[in-house]
Interface confidence: medium
């Protein structure tokens, strides 16, 4: 399954993959 | 109830810049990216670019990067997009989308877009 | 970057099925949203991740996304149908794409 976007405020590596759970995208608010 | 709210049309001359706002209400603000999507006159939508709204922290096209600035004010729950160096083929309608949060990408809420015209 | 290619028109008599395709190189492993707007409006979710269906939406439409091609189906296609359909593409290489959008026209 493609991954999900993790919401704002999460940690993003620089092309929106998997981070802490896999398959989500980061919340608004993270570091990158 | 949910809506985002986008300011008025604008009239603008080649190599000015504009500032488009986009006032979110009935959600946490700070829960959502915040994209802008564009139309020109009887074409299809091209993304431009998204916000995060609680680091300020943006993601642009690479067809509006050096050109489009995004920016936020939390406390007012709003968020800006500024294009520079405007060019004809800049005349369009300009929407904010609201993105869902920890899904796929999808935009469950749009404003209603501000049209911007570019001429001499 | 992705190409998402669709049909420019697609017309149907009132009551058949629409089918609208968002074609793209493996679009099968992406995640796919249609989007429909109406003339002087902002676009609308419809369906999302390929085959969910958004709030308010009816059963009529539906989403199917494999290999390289994604279909939006609409049955018993209604007047008030008729609008711009636009495919639009997330994952994590190649940001937001939207495809060049379908106009359907529903006939009569």
């Known amino acids: 399954a493609p991954d999900t976007r993790p919401a704002p405020g999460s940690t993003a590596p620089p092309a929106h993959g998997v981070t802490s759970a896999p398959d989500t995208r980061p919340a608004p608010g993270s570091t990158a | 109830r949910m809506q985002l709210v986008q300011s008025g049309a604008e009239v603008k001359k080649p190599g000015a810049s504009v500032k488009l706002s986009c006032k979110a209400s009935g959600y946490t603000f700070a829960g959502h990216y915040m994209h802008w999507v564009r139309q020109a006159p009887g074409r299809g939508l091209e993304w431009m670019g998204w916000i995060d709204p609680v680091t300020g922290g943006t993601k642009y096209a690479q067809n509006f990067q050096g050109w489009v600035t995004m920016t936020r004010d939390t406390s007012i729950r709003t968020a800006y997009m500024e294009l520079s160096r405007l060019r004809s083929d800049d005349t369009a309608m300009y929407y904010c989308a609201r993105e869902v949060t920890g899904d796929r990408g999808q935009f469950d809420k749009w404003g209603q877009g501000t049209l911007v015209t570019v001429a001499s | 970057q992705s190409v998402l290619t669709q049909p420019p028109s697609v017309s149907v008599a009132p009551g058949k099925t629409a089918r609208i395709t968002c074609g793209g190189n493996?679009?099968?492993?992406?995640?796919v949203h249609w989007y429909q707007q109406k003339p002087g409006q902002a676009p609308v979710l419809v369906i999302y991740y390929g085959s969910d269906r958004s709030s308010g939406i009816p059963e009529r439409f539906s989403g199917s996304n494999s290999g390289n091609t994604a279909t939006l189906t609409i049955s018993r296609v209604e007047a008030g149908d008729e609008a711009d359909y636009y495919c639009q593409v997330w994952d994590s290489s190649s940001d937001w794409v939207f495809g060049g959008g379908t106009k359907l026209t529903v006939l009569g």
């Open positions: 493996n679009i099968g492993s992406k995640s």
